[in-house]
Amino acid sequence: QSSLTPLMVNGILGESVTLPLEFPAGEKVNFITWLFNETSLAFIVPHETKSPEIHVTNPKQGKRLNFTQSYSLQLSNLKMEDTGSYRAQISTKTSAKLSSYTLRILRQLRNIQVTNHSQLFQNMTCELHLTCSVEDADDNVSFRWEALGNTLSSQPNLTVSWDPRISSEQDYTCIAENAVSNLSFSVSAQKLCEDVKIQYTDTKM
């Protein structure tokens, strides 16, 4: 990737990622420098007859760093702080080629939950207030609520009225998604409203 347009690479928290390096064809490489946020990560001197010299200069990521045969950077056990700008400089006798990358770390979504704050009105209509959440949600998580294939809400929250006298059994499903994973959780309107009805009759007695 040219230095003008960094290659954006997605990594998944806790997993591994490779930043691919392309060599200038037919040219002998003198050395390669890898940088992270403009700070040196590693310095590599290739040798034709023996193993390359690899000097890891960033102790923070050092143990998790590896290089392929073509000196592409491999980073394992990804952490959120690995997010940022990476550059590789390949120096030959005649030129220096720069490759730029932007690494973004995404979380696999975990632990989807739905909380319910519902009320029963005197006409026996049940108003459902549902809130969906996942662990460590960020701005890249999309939430939506669906029922019978229709999207009822595009937010973590859903407010809907359900009348047991005219409505058949209805499931509401929250779907949480990001670029690398999706989770869903369904709740039954009938079950939630029955629970509210029990509470309602208990308080009336």
Epitope: L7, M8, V9, N10, T102, R104, D139, N140, S142, F143, R144, W145, E146, T151, L152, S153, S154, Q155, P156, N157, L158, T159, V160, I175, E177, N178, A179
Partner: antibody, heavy 118, light 106 residues
Framework: QVQLVQSGSELKKPGASVKVSCKAS????????MNWVRQAPGQGLEWMGW????????RYADDFKGRFVFSLDTSVSTAYLQISSLKAEDTAVYYC???????????WGQGTTVTVSS | QIVLSQSPATLSLSPGERATMSCRAS?????MHWYQQKPGQAPRPWIY???NLASGVPARFSGSGSGTDYTLTISSLEPEDFAVYYC?????????FGGGTKVEIK
């Protein structure tokens, strides 16, 4: 039917403020996020950010942090975009757009033209 | 942010011809949405989640793709199809649009 109706065109002087409204009808306003999109003359579409219509929490794209404010009046199912300290480069058509999920904008307002000129 | 590059910028074709436009993302995205815009009008939803046609969109339109490369195809252009088409990604904030492909009459 589901629709978004925006307020009319505005002509403002540099340094002034403007408030654009977007009135929703035909659906439960607090169930769908509202997005704002800018289109400068002869240019493409720029996502400005969105507001959670249930919680009222706004989220702004980096280029729209500071002078741009999203707000709501849920009692009249209306979203607002306020721009302060207007500059000539704010001259554009501003659209509100409903998020149907996965940031797919299934319903758009007709657009409000804001012209900033001395 | 994820940059979406649309190509070509302009597509000059005659009615009845096939139109193919591309949207390339600077990073892998899960799905792509497409919108149609005509002069003086608001954008209209056209294709959502890569390949699903929005309500009222004719079957001559189709969408495909995955990862970083997405395509909108019009099998046989009709006069009403001449417009600007924008792609938009949802995988990462900020939600970004491509620069648009203008389909004009040759």
């Amino acid at each position: 039917q589901v629709q978004l109706v925006q307020s009319g065109s505005e002509l403002k002087k540099p340094g002034a403020s403007v408030k654009v409204s977007c009135k929703a009808s035909g659906y439960t306003f607090t169930n769908y996020g509202m997005n704002w999109v800018r289109q400068a003359p002869g240019q493409g579409l720029e996502w400005m950010g969105w507001i959670n219509t249930y919680s009222g929490e706004p989220r702004y794209a980096d280029d729209f942090k500071g002078r741009f404010v999203f707000s709501l009046d849920t009692s009249v199912s209306t979203a607002y975009l306020q721009i302060s300290s207007l500059k000539a480069e704010d001259t554009a058509v501003y659209y509100c757009a409903r998020d149907y999920g996965r940031w797919y904008f299934d319903v758009w307002g007709q657009g409000t033209t804001v012209t900033v000129s001395s | 942010q994820i940059v979406l590059s649309q190509s070509p910028a302009t597509l000059s074709l005659s009615p009845g011809e096939r139109a193919t436009m591309s949207c390339r993302a600077s990073s892998s995205v899960s799905h792509m949405h497409w919108y149609q815009q005509k002069p003086g009008q608001a954008p209209r939803p056209w294709i959502y989640a890569t390949s699903n046609l929005a309500s009222g969109v004719p079957a001559r339109f189709s969408g495909s793709g995955s990862g970083t490369d997405y395509t909108l195809t019009i099998s046989s252009l009709e006069p009403e199809d001449f417009a600007v088409y924008y792609c938009q990604q949802w995988s990462s904030t900020p939600r970004t649009f491509g620069g648009g492909t203008k389909v004009e009459i040759k």
